[in-house]
Interface confidence: medium
Amino acid sequence: SYHDRKSKVDLDRLNDDAKRYSCTPRNYSVNIREELKLANVVFFPRCLLVQRCGGNCGCGTVNWRSCTCNSGKTVKKYHEVLQFEPGHIKRRGRAKTMALVDIQLDHHERCDCICSSRPPR
Amino acid sequence: SYHDRKSKVDLDRLNDDAKRYSCTPRNYSVNIREELKLANVVFFPRCLLVQRCGGNCGCGTVNWRSCTCNSGKTVKKYHEVLQFEPGHIKRRGRAKTMALVDIQLDHHERCDCICSSRPPR
């Protein structure tokens, strides 16, 4: 019939996509010192790319404005970086000891929309 | 030598990645009524997935805290949606006329980090 032969636009799928794919893991750069809460250390690179939940929650849901996009599964991943620590005074100024270290940063593997039962005031 | 044989950790590449891939086009759901600033119309779906710049600017840059992730190239894309408009009162309640409409929404194709010359106070 006419209906079988025609190409269709699936609005339900578009609606689902807005809900499903707007809150997903995505790239963010994090400052290693801030992330590890270390003040007296310098890293190279200063920042690393991590996967963190972001975007917004598909606004097709009821009370969508009261929803937040949170991690549903977090894993710790190792990253190799150079760590510099202030050393002793030398003739040519402050020396730094350098080491290649493995640090662990949180990566979000799955994201969920967490919605409060009632919208914000 | 030992250094040649050992697989190198390319820290420069990690540094570049943090700058390059943290500010990129990513999925966001937008409320069509809000986006088009239309009050007396209802759409299905209410929301659509669009590509908008997001993330943060690679914090390896100087004054990275004063940088914002903005669209470097924006294109308008068509989306088919159903538009309902309140009709006249009928016996069985308020009638709605329905139309399939093509709306245009902004999609960000490229993102740039725009940094002010000095950091915020």
Epitope: S1, Y2, H3, R5, K6, S7, K8, V9, D10, L11, D12, N15 | F44, Y78, H79, E80, L82, M98, A99, L100, D102
Partner: antibody, heavy 126, light 107 residues
């Protein structure tokens, strides 16, 4: 604003050829099925041909089958009708019109012939 | 092929009259039918789709009803701008077919 603009009509001798074009704007042409409809002077409307969004399905009225060819160029937002072996009875105003089918909430809804072009006149006469 | 028989082929009516036009399909077409209005020298304009749904922007004095093989277009109170020719169209199966048209004239 949705617009369909036909062109290419004119006077042609029986047995001759013409190519009609329909330029589309203001909507996502590549997702719509497109149609040609004609109207002979003082007569009613007659469906001529349809083409699906990706050109995978094409249909013709028996009266034009084997003589007319419908095609589209989604990159150019254009619909075409190649008319060969024209006859006097092909004299008409030719309109292009769009149609689409959508599914939502388990319902299939057809939005067909909601926008038409202004028409282009084809006259087949010796 | 599905034949669409439209009646009457013409009618005369006055402003304010209630006008009814019918279309009969030679076989069941569910609600896959639309109604169009055409004025001289102009392209057709869709009034009703899916047998009974009013096209956005069309006055509510126009209404459609029916399913299967019998369909009706009603103009509840004829206005001066409604004098035109009206066509039904079935899109249940190819070839798509129009009714023969109904010319609504001023009495």
């Amino acid at each position: 604003e949705v617009q369909l603009v036909e062109s290419g009509g004119g006077l042609v001798k029986p047995g001759g050829s013409l190519r009609l074009s329909c330029a589309a704007s203001g909507f996502n042409f590549r997702t719509y099925n497109m149609n040609w409809v004609r109207q002979a002077p003082g007569k009613g409307l007659e469906w001529v041909s349809s083409i699906s969004s990706s050109s995978s399905n094409i249909y013709y009225a028996d009266s034009v089958k084997g003589r007319f060819t419908i095609s589209r160029d989604n990159a150019k937002n254009s619909l075409y009708l190649q008319m060969n072996s024209l006859r006097a009875e092909d004299t008409a105003v030719y309109y292009c019109a769009r149609d689409i089918m959508i599914t939502f909430g388990g319902i299939i809804a057809s939005f067909y012939f909601d926008y038409w072009g202004q028409g282009t006149l084809v006259t087949v006469s010796s | 092929d599905i034949q669409m028989t439209q009646s009457p082929s013409s009618l005369s009516a006055s402003v304010g009259d209630r006008v009814t036009i019918t279309c009969r399909a030679s076989q069941g077409i569910r609600n896959d039918l639309g109604w169009f209005q055409q004025k001289p020298g102009k392209a057709p304009k869709r009034l009703i789709y899916a047998a009974s749904s009013l096209q956005s922007g069309v006055p509510s004095r126009f209404s459609g009803s029916g399913s299967g093989t019998e369909f009706t277009l009603t103009i509840s109170s004829l206005q001066p701008e409604d004098f035109a020719t009206y066509y039904c169209l079935q899109h249940n199966s190819y070839p798509l077919t129009f009714g023969g048209g109904t010319k609504v004239e001023i009495k």
